[in-house]
Every structure is written in C-alpha cells, then in structure tokens.
C-alpha cells in the first residue's frame, strides 16, 4: 500500500488532513500528548480504518473502546474506505487518560479522497484502475512482471512532414494517438477540494528530454490534445475540477533506451496544499506511474517474410526479375529503389535494418538507418519511414565511420537457448576485429552500445575484419528447418569446397571449369585451382578465420555441429591479406520462408549441372527448402557483395512479447 | 586508362585544415585502389593513405595516422584526402595514384601495395 | 631515414648497365613480393617501372628488370639511355603500421 503523510494531532485544537484513499496515514498521537496523561482510545468515523500496533512484536488490533498505553512503542495508522462527500466528513477522536486528571479529547477531521495514475501495468493493453493493488513504481520482467510500456514515437503519420511524430509538439490525429501510451489520472473528492489543493504531474529533469505527455480533452477531437510535459516542461500544473472526474495523458517516448538512458522513464502525480498563501505549498501525496521505453528488435531468417527491398541499377533487370519471382513465391511485397534514387547504392542490406518495437497495443515496424550514408542515405527517411514505419539511427552522420558501420555486419540468430539462459529474440551479431590495432575495424561504438542497451538481445561480436568488406554476412547465414532447434546455422567453408573439387578431380573431372559462360571472365579448372598452393594458403588462413567464429557461434549460441551446414566456399586474399570470395558467395543469401535465393556460384558443372548448386542443394532441400540460384555476378559480386548485400527484408515481428523475458 | 588530378592544396597555417581532391576521368574510380603518396621539396617520396575499391577498409602511415582521413565518392568519381591538424613537415607535393583492382587474378596480385596511374600533384605548404 | 635503403647516386655511360639496391628487413622486402620501382624526372610525377619484384607495366622497356634476394631488391637498367637519368625509387609492402614503405631514393645521371 502507499504511503501517506505523518499526521500529528493536538488537544489545543482540532486537525485537518487529507488521506488518499489506497494509502497508510501514520498518526502522531504521541508528541502533542498532555504531560500527565499514560493513555489513549481512539473513535473513528465509519469511513476510516484506525490500526494500533504495539510492537515490538507489532501486535494489530482494529479500534474499539480499549485504552493503550501511550508510548512510543504504540504505531497508529489510517486508512480511508470511501471519499469524503464534503471537506472533513470523517472524524477521529482521540482520548487522552491520566490518573490525576479528566480525560482529554484531540479531534482529526480527515477528507478522503481518490487520486491514482493508473497505466497499462498488467500489459494487456487496457488501462485498468490499480488502486492499491500493485505497486506501479517499479517495472519488472518476465510472464508475471509488471510495469507500463511506451513507444518512441518514431514514426511519420503527417505525410507533408519530414520529420518524426515525436520531434513535434503536436498529436496530428487518431493515428498518431495510437503510437502512444494511455495513462489515466482518476480523481474523487468533495466539490471544493480543489481549492485549497492542486495536483501537478512531473518527470525527473534527467528525464524530461526522453518523454512528452499529452493531456487530452475528453469527448473532444484528439486535435485538442495539448503538450503538458516534455522537453520543455518538467511538470505541470492541472486544473482539475473536484468531484468524481477522470483525466486522460497520452505518453510517448522521444528516445531508445542508449547506453546513458537505461529506457525507464517515472511519471508522477503530486498533491500539494496550497491553503496557507503565506508559505509553501506541502505536499500531501504523490503517485507514480514507472514505464520502460520498448526496445528496437531485429528479426532473423526464420520470422516469416513480409516485404522485400532492392535496387534498380544499370543492367540488373534479370536480377531484379529473379528477386521478383522469389518475392511472389513467398507471397511478399517488393519494393524498388529507382536508379534516380539510389545514385548507383546498390547495397540495400547495408543501408539499413529493419527491426520493429512493441507495446502491448501496438506494433510498429522501425527502420535502423547505418550511419554509412552513401547512395541511398536518404532511403530509409524518405521511403521507408512513415505512416506505422517507424525510423532511428545512431554513429556520426559525417565521417568517422568504417566498413564494419554497414548492416550486412549486423544479424540476428533465431531464438536460442544457452547453458540453460534463454534467448527468446535470439542475440545479434556484429563483426569487430579480433584485437585493437592501428589500422583494424569496429563497429562505431554509438552503434554497439544501443545495439546492447536494448537488452533484450544481447550481442555477440564475431571477428569479421579478415574480410575485405568485413561483413559477418560474407561468412554465415541462419535458414528455418522443421526440427531440432528449428533452423540450421550456414556457415561458408572452404575445406568443404576443397573436398568437393578434390573428388570431382578423383572422379576425373579435373578438366571441368569454374566460371563456364562468364563472358571476360577467366575461366579456372578445377585441377589448377587444386594445384594452386598460394590459393590454398589463403583458403586455410580464410578456415581458421571461419573457424574462430564456428566456435563463438557454439559457444554464444548454444549450438552443436549437427546445428551447422557448411557450405562449400573459396575466398582469396587481396590487398592487405583481406579476404574476398573466389566466386559468387553462396551463405549471402535471402531467405524468404522456405525459398532462397543463392548468389550463383558458375561453378564447374559436371554431368549437365554445376557441382557447386548440387551440393548445396543436397545440403539444404532436405530441410524443406527451395533453393533458386541467382546470376548476380557482374551487377553485384564483382563489386564485392552478392544476394544478400544488395536486398533487404521486412519481417513479421515475433509472437514472444519481449517483456516476458528476463535479460 | 584512369586518368588523375588533384586539387585543393594551398597556403595553411600550423593546426589548420585542407580537403584535397583526386578526380578520376576516362574509367569509372569505383574499380581502382587509391593512394596518397606525398613528396616534400627536395626529398623523397613518402606513401600517406590507401583505401580499398570497395571502399570497405583505409589504411595509414604512422606519420598522419589520426589526423588525416581518405574516403571517396564513387558516384562522383573522386577520393578525397582530409588533412586537420596541419604541421611544418606536411608541406610536400601530394600525388594521388590508382591501381586497377582487377578480380580476374586468382589470387592477390599485390596491385593494392603499387601505384601505375599518378596524378600531377598539388601543394601543401603549411607555415605561419 | 627511409625505412627502405638505397644507394644516394649510380651513374653510367650510355650503353652500359647500372643496379640499383634496395635493402629492407624481412618484415618487408624479404618477406613480400610485392617490391616496385618508380622513375621521377626532375618536376614530373613518378612512373611506375616494375611491381611485384619483377613484373614490367606494359610499355616500359625491356631494359629495365627487377629482382630479389633475401632482404635485398635489385632494379637494373641494360642500355643504358640519356633519357634514363632521373631519380628511381623502390617500395615495398610492410608488415610494420605503415604498410607501404618507399626507399630514399637513388639519382642515376648518364655520364
């Protein structure tokens, strides 16, 4: 239960307080007692509930006609059962008992009244009253956690605007009504209360730039809504009518929780009592009301697929028809970036992210724009973003950023368990170097902190750097599969590769051609890339490499060997001993459902069809999966990236509500 | 053939900044590796920055490691050289050059660690 | 200092032949391939003459050849012509924090 005021009471004079219906009001009959007196007995009102302990042990007992023992052993506390109808209808008499004198009276009137901020605290998406029921000041997680949710409301529901709903001081319509959280203050109190008490509604300073709140005007068009705390305003003054009234606040966040904002954000009410204009206002009460700002959440290959992004460049039609077809088959949305707009960007997967957050009433997709800042910089604002599409971004928007910055290095795995701790979301993972040097890469540490301040998917680094463009999806891939941990980590290989053409060379195929039908291309036998000691060097380095991370993954997420594919790849090194793939990189693939689309690997085809997409094949569709193979070679993998680079995919947020896990 | 040149070089105080620009013409910048090689008045030559083809990875010479940053803009067809904290020893003429990332090689043919295309050059004098 | 050493001048008759060393350490020249040669005439912009040890751009003369031993490359130049007399510079890739190193430098003037 709440906690109340000390009130102390005195025989001089009669005592007027306030109790709010829901707390503990302790009496100080004590301090103000006549000097003789060794007794009491209290008499109350109906309406109020007197407890007397004497402890210690506390021994309880409700009144009657009894006399205690005064002294400061005996805790006496009130509650009220109902609001006063009129300012001090509830009376409480106290008897004081000396041996040598007449008793003395002290008298308390109290008024009752109902004053609760009331939220979405049980998570069902309703605002229900929770008067003295739980304790709203603090936020917990797990299926029997409590504590109200807000959305950062970072979409745009004004199409004419550039700018998101929440970096304005408006609620535009119903709509944007929607992205916020309803919080509920529900007042009772005698008709002229109000007079000789106000109610303000404030937020810590520290947190006043993280929250806007909104007052709305019942039965009134949400146009009548108006900005009562945010940036600006740390608290607020309310004009509230007495009687039984009830006020509504729509909340929203302003920002992510980030490594200096750990996502809560305490909205309270306090009652003060203005009645003495010759001192300070005192307050009586206050309530709060605690809420956890939603954290973005990415989605990995195993969510169902609901849109596809890509861009028109010079001469990627067949591309964009094959990515086209999967699109359908899947039974997904296709969007295109036009060439006009792209400004020949076209690797989609590194612009952006597409994760989505989540309040109990409401979901809303949210686009994580990399601070890379190419050709399509102004894609995820301009196109993606609006209407339910939320948008956020983090890192320099101006230099000082590096290839691991991009998002083709940042996944997510499907959900995992590890050493028995839950990942119901699953955990990011990013590539980083494997030790700090001069010259090494790291993602931009804005970027790790608010991937980790989410908290809900705790990140994993891999070591990605031994790659040119130092992707992690150059290396690995997550795809569904119907059993044990309902999906299969691809992993690229190049002993797997290896092993391949060493037996097509066994069977006598040795003669047979990489790269068969490239124009300009110089075709490789599989014999002379066999015999080519310096490509193997490089390939055993590349292993050892994929390995450090093969072990990570085990480790981080979980999993045994029998959870892993590999799938057959060469890499060379290039400038720098940096790592490029030798021919189209087969794990950068999209995986739409059950259907994949493969970068295109013109391997030496053997028998009428190349060994390469055999292999994977055989590897994959007896997973249930549908694999097409992708000609991206001269739009795309000459330019160092493949499938998965230059797409981007929207999918459906998970059925597992984030705050019924526990971090 | 890719052919280079620079600009943007001058007249700088110690501490000052400069941008200096190498714009490509006759084929497309986004297939070369780029460097900066810088050469002081009556000196040698000194190799300052490199970035890749891809423009996923940069790397430096101790000498302006953290004080200088190359980038580039493919879409523009230029590499950029970005100098802050300028001293008396920067003062040299600054070449950019290029080499031709070709992928048909089978493995690295070292084209990141030679310069075959140079461009004119353009100064950096800083003094007070 | 240059990381790389090379001898400050060479000279030659027309028609002769003149070596250039380059010596290095085996965190450079000895251990990588990848040593080039450049040619600078007095306010020109350097020419590159041979990269990867030995391997000739194409329409530079045959006279001009690399090799290496050890930590130690080699330009030589056969014939030697007027035209030849410039400055010529070796570099190589280092696995030290700078990765490109450039030798001193070496004046070759055809007597």
């Known amino acids: 239960m709440a906690q109340g005021t000390l009130i102390r009471v005195t025989p001089e004079q009669p005592t007027h307080a306030v109790c709010v219906l829901g707390t503990l009001t302790q009496l100080d009959i004590c301090s103000s007692a006549p000097e003789d007196c060794t007794s009491f007995s209290i008499n109350a009102s109906p309406g109020v509930v007197v407890d007397i302990a004497h402890g210690p042990p506390a021994k309880k007992k409700s009144t009657g006609s009894s006399t205690w023992p005064l002294d400061p052993g005996v805790e006496v506390t009130l509650t009220m059962k109902v609001a006063s109808g009129s300012t001090g209808d509830q009376k409480v008499q106290i008897s004081y008992y000396g041996p040598k004198t007449p008793p003395v009276k002290a008298l308390l009137y109290l008024t009752g009244v109902e004053i609760s901020l009331c939220a979405d605290i049980t998570r069902t998406g309703k605002v229900k009253p929770t008067r003295a029921v739980k304790d709203q000041r603090t936020w917990t997680w797990g299926p029997c956690g409590q504590g109200a949710i807000l959305l950062v409301n970072c979409d745009r529901d004004n199409l004419e605007s550039s700018a998101m709903d929440c970096e304005d001081d408006e609620v535009l319509d119903s709509e944007d009504l929607q992205d916020m959280s309803l919080m509920t203050l529900s007042t009772k109190t005698p008709k002229d209360f109000f007079t000789n008490h106000t109610l303000v509604l404030h937020v810590a300073r520290s947190e006043m730039d993280k929250v806007r709140v909104f007052q709305a005007t019942r039965g009134k068009l949400s146009s009548k809504c108006s900005v009562v705390l945010g940036p600006k305003w740390p608290s607020h003054y309310l004009m509230v009518p007495g009687g039984k009234h009830n006020m509504d606040f729509y909340v929203e966040a302003l920002a992510f929780p980030d490594t200096d904002f750990p996502g809560l954000i305490t909205l309270t009410i306090s009652l003060l009592d203005t009645s003495n204009l010759e001192l300070p206002e005192a307050v009586v009460f206050q309530d709060s009301v605690v809420f956890r700002v939603a954290p973005w959440i990415m989605t990995p290959n195993t969510q169902p697929p609901q849109e596809v992004y890509a861009c028109s460049i010079f001469e990627n039609e067949d591309f964009l028809k094959s990515v086209t077809t999967l699109a359908m088959k899947a039974k997904c949305k296709l969007t295109i970036c036009p060439e006009e707009e792209n400004m020949d960007d076209q690797w989609m997967q590194d612009e952006m992210e597409i994760g989505y957050i989540q309040a109990p009433h409401k979901t809303l997709p949210v686009v994580f724009d990399s601070p890379r800042n190419r050709g399509l910089k102004e894609f995820p604002i301009k196109r993606v973003m609006g209407p339910d599409f939320g948008y956020v971004t983090r890192g320099p928007q101006t230099g000082g950023i590096s290839g691991l910055d991009s998002f083709g290095n940042l996944e997510v795995s499907p959900p995992v368990t590890v050493r028995g701790k839950e990942y119901p979301l699953g955990r990011i993972l990013f590539g980083d170097s494997c030790y700090p040097s001069n010259d090494s890469r790291q993602m931009h540490q804005a970027l790790q902190d608010f991937l980790s301040a989410q908290q809900v998917q705790a990140p994993v680094k891999l070591y990605s750097d031994w790659l040119s463009v130092g992707h992690v999806d150059e290396f690995l891939s997550f795809v569904p599969a119907p059993d044990r941990k309902g999906f299969r980590l691809l992993l690229a290989s190049p002993r797997s590769c290896y092993k391949l053409f060493q037996e097509q060379q066994n069977e006598g195929h040795g003669e047979a051609l990489l790269f068969e039908g490239i124009k300009k291309k110089k075709q490789q036998k599989i014999k002379n890339i066999l015999s080519n000691k310096t490509l193997r060097e490089h390939n055993s380095f590349v292993e050892r490499c994929i390995d450090w991370n093969r072990e990570l993954l085990k480790r981080e997420l979980g999993l045994a060997e029998s959870d892993i594919i590999d799938i057959p790849q060469l890499f060379k090194l290039k400038e720098f001993s940096k790592a490029e793939a030798f021919f189209p990189n087969m794990v950068n693939m999209l995986v739409l459902g059950k259907h994949l689309g493969i970068p295109k690997p013109f391997g030496p085809v053997i028998n009428g069809r190349c060994c390469l997409e055999e292999k994977v094949c055989s590897l994959l569709e007896p997973l249930g999966l549908q694999c097409t193979f992708i000609n991206d070679f001269f739009t795309y993998h000459i330019r160092h990236g493949e499938v998965h680079c230059g797409t981007n995919v929207r999918r459906k947020p998970f059925s597992f509500k984030w705050w019924n896990m526990v971090p | 053939q890719v052919q280079l040149v620079e600009s943007g070089g001058g007249l700088v105080k110690p501490g000052g900044s400069l941008r200096l620009s190498c714009a490509a013409s006759?084929?497309?910048?986004?297939?070369?590796?780029v460097s900066w090689i810088r050469q002081a008045p009556g000196k040698g030559l000194e190799w300052v920055s490199f970035?890749?083809?891809?423009?996923?990875?940069?790397y430096y010479a101790d000498s302006v490691r953290g004080r200088f940053t190359i980038s580039r803009d493919n879409a523009k067809n230029s590499v950029y050289l970005q100098m802050n904290s300028l001293r008396a020893e920067d003062t040299a003429v600054y070449y950019c050059?290029?080499?031709?990332?070709?992928?048909?090689?089978?493995?690295?043919?070292?084209?990141?660690?030679?310069?075959?295309?140079w461009g004119r050059g353009t100064l950096v004098t800083v003094s007070s | 200092q240059s990381a790389l050493t090379q001898p400050r001048s060479v000279s030659g008759s027309p028609g002769q032949s003149v070596t250039i060393s380059c010596t290095g350490t085996?965190?450079?020249?000895?251990?990588?391939?990848?040593v080039s040669w450049y040619q600078q005439h007095p306010g020109k912009a350097p020419k590159l003459i041979i990269y990867?040890?030995?391997e000739r751009p194409s329409g530079v003369p045959d006279r001009f050849s690399g090799s290496k031993s050890g930590n130690t490359a080699s330009l030589t130049i056969s014939g030697l012509q007027a035209e030849d007399e410039a400055d010529y510079y070796c570099?190589?890739?280092?696995?030290?924090?700078?990765?490109?190193?450039f030798g001193g430098g070496t004046k070759l003037t055809v007597l």
């Open positions: 050059s290029s080499a031709n990332d070709d992928v048909d090689d089978i493995v690295a043919p070292g084209r990141g660690y030679y310069m075959d295309v």
């Open positions: 006759g084929s497309t910048l986004s297939d070369y590796f």
């Open positions: 970035i890749n083809a891809a423009n996923t990875f940069t």
């Open positions: 085996s965190g450079d020249v000895g251990r990588y391939s990848h």
């Open positions: 990867n040890v030995y």
């Open positions: 570099s190589s890739h280092s696995r030290s924090s700078t990765p490109v190193l």
